[in-house]
């Protein structure tokens, strides 16, 4: 190459399809056969073109026709007279991809092709997107400014056309498009949250455009608060509403996880509250939803659980009534007798003594959820409840001997049943049969019987003398026997008996005594008379 001719241009130029680029270029040529007034012509050619016959892609030579495919798109913006060969390529197309070289003509001598020192134009797919600058969270009713920037700007290149679309732009105000950015002002509404706002950048060639979509985040108070429940690590379900407050039944010992989630912007602080006691809370940036774990629910975990979601724009809360179900526990009988208000707790197998004729109230008590069905049985027979509204209460206004025996309270429950039994023993004072006497060969034989509960004791009196055991003189003999509530005693009197003596049989227990007398001893023909006294 002639050392007096040189050109400086980048070796490779890359431009996205449809865009415009400016290629800086400078060159030098000898001052030979031209003056300052001699016109300087510059030409850019595709490397496939013959410079003498072919059309350049750009030139400042008005009478020279340019390549049809580049007409109006390629422009020699530099002044060849000043050694400037800068070229602008607008609306770059795939077919423009090629090697290009520059030719200068000035006067008769300077007619030179810079054949080996051109540039290669590579046209790439348009993948660049505009950048949209928008506050992270928008306040409803507060005007906001959004900027869209497309970072591709060259001198001599026309600015692209910007446009905006989005549901929030029913009444937008846009500032005029400037070189490579657009400013949009609008006032977001609550309903604009989660809607799209798109900045479109359109270039001269039809169909060549770039766009960027952002999702609007408009601040709003918590809404759509949802409580869901996961039990024993099963997937979460929403509780069933019962009235205004959802109701949840859980079995004692179950694993429960209560989950609370709310839609809000900015994210809300979530908290779980049980009867005004905060059980757990989350930071706005913490994990969502907020979980409350009850590893093995207890009866004491029952109650109203409230989830509260709160941010600077407001709050929302929802409650959940938890009922922990469990089978009967601590089943026992409380007893009130003889109108005493003092209640005693009796456990299973207790024996309960009651005085005949007294009143007795048995109250069966247990804890369970839901309440167990209570009933009383005696010797396998179901007893009618004294108070149908409270089948756990059994009232016996006058206890009779026939009431004696086992009473059982049954607590029936879907999760398991229990029963408690107590043994009722009816106490009464002695009832006396006798005494009766008869003569026998050995002497006078008398017998006396008594029934009582507890079993009575019997003793004999002859006049004022108490006859106990056997006399030392063998003058009498007492033979006791007993079976259950009966006590029997036989008295044998030997030897002479003075007439007019009074023989008495006495029966006694803790509840009282009864005695019967024979006022006149019988002759050997039988009994004369008998009198009873208590």
């Amino acid at each position: 190459m002639d050392g007096r001719f040189w050109i400086r241009v980048q070796e490779s130029v890359m431009v996205p399809e449809g865009l415009c680029i400016s290629v800086p270029c400078s060159f030098s040529y000898p001052r030979q056969d031209w003056t300052g007034s001699t016109p300087a012509y510059g030409y850019w050619f595709k490397a496939v073109t013959e410079t003498t016959k072919g059309a350049p892609v750009a030139t400042n030579h008005q009478s020279r026709e340019v390549e049809m495919s580049t007409r109006g798109r390629f422009q020699l913006t530099g002044d060849p007279a000043k050694g400037n060969c800068s070229l602008v390529i607008r609306d770059a197309q795939m077919q423009d991809e090629s090697q290009y070289f520059f030719r200068v003509e000035r006067g008769s001598y300077v007619r030179y092709n810079f054949m080996n020192d051109g540039f290669f134009l590579k046209v790439t797919a348009l993948t660049q997107k505009p950048d949209v600058y928008i506050p992270e969270t928008l306040e409803p009713g507060q005007p906001v400014t959004v900027i869209c920037v497309f970072n591709w700007a060259f001198e001599e290149c026309p600015p692209p056309s910007f446009s905006w679309t989005g549901a929030a732009l029913s009444s937008q105000g846009t500032k005029p498009t400037t070189s490579h950015f657009s400013v949009l002002s609008f006032t977001p509404r609550p309903q604009d949250h989660n809607t799209d706002l798109t900045c479109h950048v359109d270039f001269s060639r039809k169909g060549v455009s770039a766009q960027r979509t952002v999702r609007l985040r408009v601040a709003y108070a918590p809404r759509d608060l949802v409580i869901s429940i996961s039990r024993d690590n099963t997937p979460a379900l929403e509780p069933q509403p019962q009235g205004n407050v959802p109701y949840l039944e859980a079995q004692k010992g179950q694993f429960l996880r209560l989950l609370c989630a709310a839609d809000s912007q900015p994210p809300a602080t979530l908290s779980w509250v049980l009867q005004n006691r905060v059980l757990s809370s989350s930071h706005p940036w913490g994990p969502r939803p907020l979980g409350l774990e009850l590893p093995g629910v207890k009866a004491g975990d029952s109650g109203r659980y409230t989830c509260r979601a709160e941010n600077r724009l407001g709050s929302q809360q929802r409650a959940l009534d938890l009922s922990v179900q469990y089978p009967p526990e601590n089943l026992r009988v409380m007893v009130s007798q003889a109108n005493r208000t003092v209640l005693e707790n009796l456990g299973n197998g207790t024996s309960l003594p009651v005085l005949e004729g007294q009143s007795l109230c048995l109250v069966c008590v247990t804890h369970s959820s839901p309440p167990a069905r209570l009933s009383w049985t005696q010797r396998g027979q179901v007893l009618s409840p004294s108070q149908p509204s409270d089948p756990g209460v059994l009232e016996l206004p006058r206890v009779q001997v026939e009431h004696e025996g086992e009473f059982t309270c049954h607590a029936r429950h879907p999760l398991g049943s229990q029963h408690v039994s107590l043994s009722l023993s009816v106490h009464y004072s002695p009832k006396l049969l006798g005494p009766s006497c008869s003569w026998e060969a050995e002497g006078l034989h008398c017998s006396c019987s008594s029934q009582a509960s507890p079993a009575p004791s019997l003793r004999w009196w002859l006049g004022e003398e108490l006859l106990e055991g056997n006399s030392s003189q063998d003058s009498f003999e007492v033979t006791p026997s007993s079976a259950g509530p009966w006590a029997n005693s036989s008295l044998s009197l030997h030897g002479g008996l003075s007439s007019g003596l009074r023989l008495r049989c006495e029966a006694w227990n803790v509840h009282g005594a009864q005695s019967g007398s024979i006022l006149q001893l019988p002759d050997k023909k039988g009994l004369i008379s008998t009198a009873f006294s208590n």
Epitope: E11, S12, S69, M94, Q95, E97, S98
Partner: antibody, heavy 120, light 107 residues
Framework: QVTLKESGPALVKPTQTLTLTCTFS??????????LSWIRQPPGKALEWLAH???????RYNPSLKSRLTISKDTSKNQVVLTMTNMDPVDTATYYC????????????WGQGTTVTVSS | DIVMTQSPATLSVSPGERATLSCKAS??????VAWYQQKPGQAPRLLIY???NRYTGVPARFSGSGSGTEFTLTISSLQSEDFAVYFC?????????FGGGTKVEIK
């Protein structure tokens, strides 16, 4: 003088991967603006452009085959390699290595072509 | 993809006669069209680029015209060596696509 020569297996089985090599001379693929393409032609049918590689290792693929194609170059060996996975009998064709005139998207230099048959 | 449709599929012409081959693009491709000639057992050969520019060494009897969507290759006076298959190609947008070809045979 610019020459291009394709080489590779004449027969491949379905599902196999085809590897074709284009060995060139008369120019350097490190020169700005230089690039090579692969084009194929099934028997008695039209030509189909497959892929292109530039001097700067930038690549272009036909979208309909992009997932199956890989083009690469070894400038020191003056070679360009095309691999095509999951071959099928419909891929039976003559495969050409071509060069664009001054980097243009029309092709002045063609290799002789290599015929590939896909059959089990 | 841009579809290039060539017609007719076969053209029967006598030597010395004029042959006109048509190529239609499914969308505007400007002048980004090239024409190739292919003889049996050979690789294609570039004839025309940019719709109307004849490639170096191509005889003057071959000429191209058209822009937008309709393009024509004309062989003014057919020589015996011109009987072959001719393909058009667009390079306006990716992917590059070729026509199905027109076979020019001796009448």
């Amino acid at each position: 003088q610019v020459t291009l020569k394709e080489s590779g297996p004449a027969l491949v089985k379905p599902t196999q991967t085809l590897t074709l090599t284009c060995t060139f001379s008369g120019f350097s693929l490190s020169t700005s603006g230089m690039g090579l393409s692969w084009i194929r032609q099934p028997p008695g049918k039209a030509l189909e452009w497959l892929a292109h590689i530039y001097w700067d290792d930038d690549k272009r693929y036909n979208p309909s085959l992009k997932s199956r194609l890989t083009i690469s170059k070894d400038t020191s060996k003056n070679q360009v390699v095309l691999t095509m996975t999951n071959m099928d009998p419909v891929d039976t064709a003559t495969y050409y290595c071509v060069r664009g005139l001054y980097g243009n998207w029309f092709f002045d230099v063609w290799g002789q072509g290599t015929t590939v048959t896909v059959s089990s | 993809d841009i579809v290039m449709t060539q017609s007719p599929a076969t053209l029967s012409v006598s030597p010395g006669e004029r042959a006109t081959l048509s190529c239609k693009a499914s969308q505007n491709v400007g002048t980004a069209v090239a024409w190739y000639q292919q003889k049996p057992g050979q690789a294609p050969r570039l004839l025309i680029y940019s719709a109307s520019n004849r490639y170096t060494g191509v005889p003057a009897r071959f000429s191209g015209s058209g822009s937008g969507t309709e393009f024509t290759l004309t062989i003014s006076s057919l020589q015996s060596e011109d009987f072959a298959v001719y393909f058009c190609q667009q390079y306006s947008s990716y992917p590059l696509t070729f026509g199905g070809g027109t076979k020019v045979e001796i009448k």
